[in-house]
């Protein structure tokens, strides 16, 4: 072992230095000093700190490892941040589309039902935002609440036009019979089953990723402990105090000073890896009626189904609610059965498929991968930071906390260490409060993930057979399927394709004649593409 | 003719318990969401519970979370509040109230007349 | 929850305007959530005058009307006649789906 080099006479090295740190030379000593009072850089002869030195170092010290920590993460999470904020705003675009594709529909085909059928959709998309972004209602309520408020407006306005206006306090009886006859059929159950299962994947998906954002910034702003300062002093700074100012640390010893300073942390490795591979499960499985894009952006052609299904069923429906809501109503009825322009153009409902198109389905896939390079980022996080800091290449000619070294020796350091605390009880004390906390809400987030990610054969069809549909209408080859009466039903493949243009809004004003009914017009649109530039939260 | 009647008010000490009740007629009580509003005396409106149609869903004010328990009976066209626990602060006119949906809090568009619930040792 | 701001008292002569403001925040008035206005005589239950921002329920005058911008809801009652002077209170939910009223605002018509 070499003899190490004269200490610097006049502390002039080492004042300069700490001049830097802390204006003013009042706590540095000309020159060198026993240092007797130092408890972290523990001198083997004269010394150039003094205890207040100390401190600050250690103070620094600590300052260092956050910055440190912090520009380790920026990287995961910008990627979280972006995307939440994206994926908000594009699940909100959906929302707004399905809401005026609802209301189009109902302009171009019922316009007597408007303008109150544009209030009912309007309240029932405020509800799925509100649902999506956390809010505590059932879905079934938000769907059996559409349909109560439809149904006497589709009974007094197209099966029983010209009811005067003393007639209209029969609107609790029809609210009552809507649920009591069935008078929709399946269809609000149907549309129950999608909506619900679509939403609750989206919520859980945008939960998720806001838990991630938590995750990354309570780790960044970890504070760091006494002892892992003082650690992190002797290794950065105590080589200073001997006059040794271009020395660096032996990597080996950086990685077990950082592996105890941050062993709370790397606790969270495990729940952090689960989390990333059931986001990943959650993310494969959103598709079909576990895709809210595909859901709501087909619920006004279900819509319009069921109300077809009303007006096939209105000479039998008329009769039944005549007697039922008598006492409302003193009148004859007569059954506007289905009048010609009440007809909707099948063309209509024949979205042409669109393929390769970048998606919210893509987008999700593409965020999956990134975050998939970022697995291991709380296991690999000691090495990051010592591959970041400076250290001597090959753990030559460096300091190992104690002294220069020509070669680090792990176990050396470590007998040097245990005079002075004990690396091995920092690392058992476990993991912060805060990181306990952030560890519980992450278990707590991939148990809900986890249950959500059914198996990949799901029973969806099942569930379509049960509501007492055909298994025919949602096969497995369809590539995907909304609505229930064959007639009805859109087949679209990755619908939005207008994402780029977060501000695009089809008013119902604008919205397409019966020729090409809500759907929107291919030189209208833009790709998704550059979302991830557009609204960047952290720009 | 829509209508809500209140019963159950009274004096009760502080401590104690008491249930109110809501009859409501005229309408499809299961369509719609139901809610509990309170009025000290000289005081503002304060909102204490809601439930939605099905019943499903309950909300309650931080004030009275985890002492009081709204509850309905579609079946009698009823709409409950459980008190208990009741403070001095608990003592105001009670509102049954109607929501004009069912699935959420939104908008009140028929009240009871009230009943007043006095809250003294 | 905290309650909506209202001022607590609006004056005018009959005839003339008067607008009340109510202000809340991003996750009650200035979310997805609707905003609504009730009239209270003393001693009588409240009236619903405005829900939805701006919707009239049948039977109210026009002369009551309602917007929402951002933050803030604002009921405005032209045409001032003796019957409006009353406690007027606005009412919306927060992103937990619970109630939250104003503080109420004593309409006196000179």
């Known amino acids: 072992q070499p003899p190490p080099p004269p200490p610097d006479a006049t502390c002039h090295q080492v004042r300069s230095f700490f001049q830097r740190l802390q204006p003013g030379l009042k706590w540095v000593p000309e020159t060198p000093v026993p240092g007797s009072d130092l408890q972290v850089c523990l001198p083997k002869g004269p010394t150039c700190c003094s205890r207040k030195m100390e401190e600050k170092y250690q103070l620094t010290a600590r300052l260092n490892m956050e910055q440190l920590l912090q520009s380790a993460s920026m990287e995961l999470k910008f990627l979280i941040i972006q995307n939440a904020a994206v994926f908000q705003e594009a699940f909100e675009i959906v929302v707004r589309h399905a809401k005026n594709y609802t209301n189009a529909m109902f302009k171009n085909n019922y316009p007597s039902l408007t303008p109150q059928a544009f209030e009912f959709v309007g309240e029932f998309f405020t509800d799925v935002s509100l649902y999506i972004l956390g809010s505590d209602i059932n879905v079934d309520d938000m769907v059996n609440e559409l349909f109560d408020s439809l149904f006497p407006v589709i009974y007094t306005q197209l099966m029983n036009p010209g009811l005067p206006d003393s007639a209209l306090d029969i609107n609790e009886c029809l609210r009552g019979a809507r649920r009591d006859l069935k008078v929709f059929g399946n269809f609000p159950k149907l549309i129950m089953t999608q909506v619900s299962k679509s939403l609750q994947v989206t919520r859980i998906f945008l939960q998720a990723l806001n838990l991630g954002i938590e995750v990354i910034n309570t780790t960044d702003h970890l504070k760091f402990s006494k002892d892992c300062g003082r650690m992190l002093t002797r290794m950065w700074y105590c080589s200073y105090c001997q006059g040794l100012m271009m020395v660096k640390p032996c990597g080996g010893y950086c990685n077990v000073v950082m592996q105890g300073c941050m062993a709370g942390v790397v606790e969270i490795d495990k729940y952090w890896r689960e989390y990333i591979l059931s986001l990943e499960e959650l993310v494969n499985g959103m598709y079909r009626i576990y895709d809210m894009e595909n859901v709501l952006l087909g619920l006004f052609s279900t819509i319009h189904d069921s109300i077809q299904y009303v007006q096939k069923n209105a000479g039998k429906l008329t009769t039944t609610i005549g007697k039922l809501c008598a006492h409302s109503q003193q009148r004859q009825y007569r059954s506007a059965y289905y009048p010609e322009d009440l007809f909707i153009d099948k063309k209509v409902l024949k979205v042409a498929h669109v393929e390769h198109e970048e998606t919210l389905s893509s987008r999700r896939r593409e965020l999956i991968q990134k975050l998939k390079s970022f697995i291991s980022f709380y296991s690999a996080l000691p090495g990051y930071i010592c591959s970041h800091s400076p250290v001597a290449e090959n753990d030559t000619l460096c300091w190992n906390g104690q002294e220069l070294v020509e070669r680090y020796s792990q176990k050396a350091a470590r007998n040097g260490m245990k005079n002075q605390f004990n690396l091995h009880e920092l690392k058992m004390k476990g993991p912060e409060p805060v990181v306990s906390q952030i560890i519980d809400k992450l278990k707590h987030i991939n148990q809900l993930l986890r249950t959500m990610s059914m198996p990949k054969g799901r029973v969806l069809d099942k569930n379509l057979d049960e509501e007492g549909f055909e298994s025919g209408d949602c096969g497995d080859d369809e590539d995907e399927c909304i609505g229930g009466s064959g007639d009805g039903m859109i087949k679209v493949k990755n619908q939005l394709r207008f994402l780029a243009e977060l501000a695009y809004d089809l008013d119902v004003d604008d919205a397409p004649g019966n020729s090409q009914q809500a759907t929107p017009k291919d030189n209208e649109i833009s790709t998704f593409h550059n979302l991830g530039n557009v609204h960047s939260p952290l720009k | 003719q829509v209508q809500l009647q209140e019963s159950g008010g009274g004096l009760v000490q502080p401590g104690r318990s008491l249930r109110l009740s809501c009859a409501a007629s005229?309408?499809?009580?299961?369509?719609?969401?139901m809610h509990w509003v309170r009025q000290a005396p000289g005081k503002g409106l304060e909102w204490v519970s809601a439930i939605s149609g099905s019943g499903g869903s309950t909300y309650y004010a931080d004030s009275v979370k985890g002492r009081f328990t709204i509850s309905r009976d579609n079946s009698k066209n009823t709409l409950y509040l459980q008190m208990n626990s009741l403070r001095a602060e608990d003592t105001a006119v009670y509102y049954c109230?109607?929501?004009?949906?069912?699935?959420?809090?939104?908008?009140?568009?028929?009240w009871g007349q009230g009943t007043l619930v006095t809250v003294s040792s | 929850q905290s309650a909506l701001t209202q001022p607590p008292s609006a004056s005018g002569s009959p005839g003339q305007s008067v607008t009340i403001s109510c202000t809340g925040t991003s996750s009650d008035v200035g979310g997805y959530n609707y905003v609504s206005w009730y009239q209270q005589y003393p001693g009588k239950a409240p009236k619903l005058l405005i829900y939805?921002?701006?919707n009239r329920p049948s039977g109210v005058p026009d002369r009551f009307s309602g917007s929402k911008s951002g933050t803030s809801a604002s009921l405005a009652i032209t045409g001032l006649q003796a019957e409006d002077g009353a406690d007027y209170y606005c009412q919306s939910y927060d992103s937990s789906l619970r109630v939250v009223f104003g503080g109420g605002t004593k309409v006196t018509v000179l």
């Open positions: 109230a109607k929501d004009r949906r069912g699935s959420h809090a939104d908008a009140f568009d028929v």
């Open positions: 939805g921002n701006s």
């Open positions: 005229g309408f499809t009580f299961s369509s719609y969401a």
